[in-house]
């Protein structure tokens, strides 16, 4: 008949498994339980995937691996008496008197429960990596952490290459023995030890679980070190950069940590496994029973088959590893799980021109000299689209793309952002808001919903803020409805008249040029260059100023650049910014200074795009280490990442305006990176590409 083969990872566990099998058999529990010996949890997962075993209980990290790599699913969860249902929370604790936040952890002293422990290491390190605060090059997480904190106590890190930094705060026992041991010999080991490390002032932050502070303060702890501690003297660090009272752990934590769970193959009936174990726990989980499912004492070990603290097993409703782990823990695991053995030795960068090939070659050499990993290789392609095709086909790994290309790369080729460019705050030409500017006019005021029949001024056909975003947004919102994919005609029929300068027109609707004025002699009307006085963002604003148009679609800085004395040309010299307003998507009007809240979209910075199976943290980790050496345009290290002047080109590999490469943080998809409004505008336009 039917049988369930449990996978044991050690001799003691095999022993307990045999006893459980025997107890179940004697009690007549069906199906019968057999035991298979594996060498480790990883090995057991492989055995289950290969149909040589059926079930094992795993912790969160292993559930993630088993689900992601082998398609296993969790079907039965553990519940612990003292915990919060089937989970507990990983928190970061600081002294109330300090000024540390989650955003200022770099350089502070840190206390951890132990190397590779869930709340003391896996969750905080994974979270810091995943959120982009901690960059890891070449999967060397230990090095990254040792460089990031200003000294730590990570019990168990003594055997690593970075023990000087990772064990710097550890103290051992009262006689100085067992420094940095992953055992009670180290006074700063485990939850209470990590908290003690913080409380005694050795560290500035402790990574512990939600109950640790309350269990070790306000007179609840016996050891002398904790007697006088008050819970009110400590606070939690929240993910949003704020801090909260230690009782607020449900709202303020790094991640909810899932309980251990029994995993099986996707084709195994989870209900059957639960019924088997439920029968077992009904008979074998209380004090006097002949076999103790949730105790390992008899075998001289802890947590065999199940955690000893398990109070009951419950069925899992949504049997996917993602649902069980929850998005917070899932994200932390993504940041942490980086196997150096599976890291490709090269990152193949897509290049589009001879100057770019030259710069890329120099970058590869410069990175190699500094032993940066993975090494750069340069691969040519004919166009951004060709790059996307080659990345999808696994012939290339990465390319930097602009907003519209990011949209195509994500939507059509399934690529994701791995790192982004960041420009100077005052640099409005590379990342900016698209706004609709109107004259302040109380008697004839209209809103964005009332643009039909108005006169419009645009920087030029195909310009992001002048055409693509506003027209895309109006299509997406249903105001402009192109027939037969003819956007130009639809726009020409929507507005009463427009100025949309264009190069090499064909069949261009005349009304899109009706407001254009050409040069001083009246020639070159509507041409896509500065001979047309209403061309470009400045020209579009001038079209509004001179009353040719009722609305101008421009950048958020255009009004400021051409008013209040910032432009001395006769048409602009006397203009005041307060005479103009913005039209907002919600139907309101706003001051021109309110562009961040009242805009059609933000034009996103360029981003490095990769396949979804590429480890984005290693890509950012490489770029982050590289920019420390080569990011400054005045560096003396022989290569300038963000400067193309040596190659007789511009914006090669990265935009020259880039100040630094930044992590994508939570913007892990093309839609997240581009922003909803920009995507909506592009979708409006792309819906017309027939």
């Amino acid at each position: 008949g039917m049988e369930v083969r449990w996978c044991a990872t050690s001799d003691p566990e095999q022993h307990k498994c045999g006893n459980m099998s025997e107890a179940f058999r004697e009690a007549g529990i069906q199906p019968s339980l057999l035991c298979v010996r594996g060498t480790s949890a990883d090995h057991c997962v492989q055995l289950i995937a290969a149909q040589e075993a059926d079930a094992i209980t795993l912790d969160g990290g292993a559930i993630y691996e088993a689900g992601k790599e082998h398609g296993l699913k969790p079907v039965v969860g553990e519940v612990y008496d003292q915990e919060v249902g089937t989970s507990y929370y990983a928190v970061a604790v600081v002294r109330r008197s300090s000024h540390v936040t989650i955003d200022t952890l770099k350089g502070v002293k840190s206390c951890h429960t132990g190397i590779n422990r869930t709340v003391g290491w896996n969750v905080p390190v994974g979270y810091l990596v995943e959120s982009g605060r901690l960059s890891v090059m070449g999967c060397d997480v230990l090095k990254a952490v040792s460089d990031y904190f200003g000294g730590s106590c990570v019990p168990g890190a003594g055997e690593t290459s970075y023990s000087e930094s990772l064990c710097r705060l550890c103290r051992g026992d009262s006689s100085g023995e067992g420094v940095c041991d992953k055992s009670p010999l180290e006074r700063y080991y485990d939850y209470s030890g990590a908290f003690r490390c913080l409380a005694e002032g050795a560290g500035d932050v402790a990574f512990v679980k939600h109950s640790t502070v309350l269990e070790n303060t306000d007179g609840k702890t016996l050891p002398s070190w904790g007697q006088a501690l008050l819970s009110q003297d400590f606070e939690l660090l929240c993910r949003d950069g704020s801090r909260a009272d230690v009782t607020e752990w449900r709202q303020c934590h790094l991640a909810r940590v899932p309980a251990h769970a029994v995993v099986v193959r996707a084709d195994t009936d989870g209900g059957l496994i639960f019924r088997l174990l439920n029968e077992g726990q009904r008979l074998f989980s209380h004090e006097g029973s002949s076999f103790q499912m949730f105790s390992s004492e008899a075998y001289g070990q802890k947590d065999l088959l199940f955690k000893d603290s398990t109070s009951e097993l419950v069925p899992i409703a949504t049997q996917t590893y993602e649902a069980w782990l929850g998005h917070e823990y899932l994200h932390a695991m993504k940041g942490l799980l980086c196997d150096p053995n599976r890291l490709p030795p090269y990152l193949r960068w897509c290049v589009l021109s001879t100057p770019e090939i030259q710069k890329c070659g120099d970058m590869a050499v410069a990175f190699r000299r500094q032993r940066l990993k993975p090494e750069i290789q340069c691969v040519s392609a004919k166009s951004p689209q060709h790059c996307m095709e080659r990345i999808q086909a696994e012939q290339v790994d990465a390319v930097t793309l602009s907003g519209e290309d990011i949209y195509t790369a994500g939507k059509t080729y399934g690529l994701v952002p791995a790192a982004g460019e960041h420009y100077a705050p005052e640099d409005s030409s590379n990342s900016y808001y698209v706004v609709a500017v109107v004259r302040r006019d109380s008697s004839h005021a209209f809103t964005l919903d009332e643009l039909r029949g108005k006169r419009s001024c645009h920087a030029g056909f195909g310009s992001p803020a002048g055409w693509d975003v506003p027209v895309g947004a109006l299509i997406q919102r249903g105001f402009i409805r192109p027939k037969d994919c003819d956007v130009l005609t639809a726009v020409s029929e929507f507005f009463n008249a427009s100025c949309v300068p264009v190069n090499n027109p064909k069949n261009y609707p005349s009304s899109l040029c009706a407001l254009c004025v050409g040069d001083e002699q009246g020639r070159n009307k509507c041409v896509g260059n500065s001979q047309e006085r209403y061309y470009g963002y400045r020209g579009a604003f001038r079209c509004l100023v001179e009353n040719a148009g009722d609305v101008a679609f421009v950048r958020h800085t255009t009004v400021f650049d051409n008013t209040n004395g910032h432009n001395s040309e006769p048409w602009a010299a006397e203009l005041r910014s307060e005479d103009y307003e913005l039209l907002c998507p919600n139907g309101a009007r706003a001051e021109v200074s309110q562009f961040a809240a009242c805009n059609l979209a933000q034009i996103p910075p360029h981003a490095v795009m990769v396949r979804p199976d590429t480890n984005i943290f290693t890509v950012y980790g490489l770029l982050d280490k590289a920019q420390d050496l080569f990011g400054d345009d005045h560096n003396k290290n022989g290569f300038k990442m963000f400067d193309s002047s040596n190659y007789h080109g511009q914006d090669l590999l990265f935009k020259d305006a880039t100040v630094r490469a930044v992590p994508v943080g939570e913007k892990t998809t093309y839609r997240g990176w581009l922003g909803l409004d920009y995507v909506a505008a592009l979708e409006g336009m792309s819906s017309q590409q027939c």
Epitope: D484, D486, T489, A497, K506, S510, S511, C513, A514, L515
Partner: antibody, heavy 118, light 107 residues
Framework: EVQLVQSGAEVKKPGESLKISCKGS????????LHWVRQMPGKGLEWMGR????????SYNQIFKDQVTISADKSISTAYLQWSSLKASDTAMYYC???????????WGQGTTVTVSS | DIQMTQSPSSLSASVGDRVTITCKAS??????VAWYQQKPGKAPKLLIY???TRHAGVPSRFSGSGSGTDFTLTISSLQPEDFATYYC?????????FGQGTKVEIK
Amino acid sequence: EVQLVQSGAEVKKPGESLKISCKGSGYSFTDYYLHWVRQMPGKGLEWMGRINPYNAATSYNQIFKDQVTISADKSISTAYLQWSSLKASDTAMYYCARGGDYDFPWYWGQGTTVTVSS
Amino acid sequence: DIQMTQSPSSLSASVGDRVTITCKASQDVYAAVAWYQQKPGKAPKLLIYWASTRHAGVPSRFSGSGSGTDFTLTISSLQPEDFATYYCQQHYRTPWTFGQGTKVEIK
């Protein structure tokens, strides 16, 4: 050089159907609109409608909307104007004209005379 | 639809004369007006668009002006080959509409 060559003169009876043609050469046929314009004997010019040969999208003057059909076959660079049932009042010269930079007639064919008489 | 009214409907002039034809639109068409020349038995030829922009190959004696609703075609010095019928057309909104034509005859 841009050339639009129209089919020859037609003499038809009322109620008959007719299809006249206009073949474009010297340019990429699908790049520009093709318009049809009517000129009745001794009268002025009337725009009938246009077609985008690239996707066969049409736009008609309401006066002519249910009277004629404009079509195109891009494989042979030819546009057509057809009637399913001619009337005496359809007697006229019909011109095809190609668009240019802008979306109105720039270059004209030599015209096709259509005579409808019982 | 936008109506285009041309005047005069015909005029007689001699070679070398300066000739002016006017066209009035029933509503504001900005500068979106074209002028065509048609000789007997021939197809029309585009002379001017955007009220004042000469089409390629059109002699400089032809010029146009105007915006809004009032437009003018001027032939600065009439040549023998200029005797023809001239039509204005608005290219602001479909349906494109033409004036009824002005016939320039030899005096």
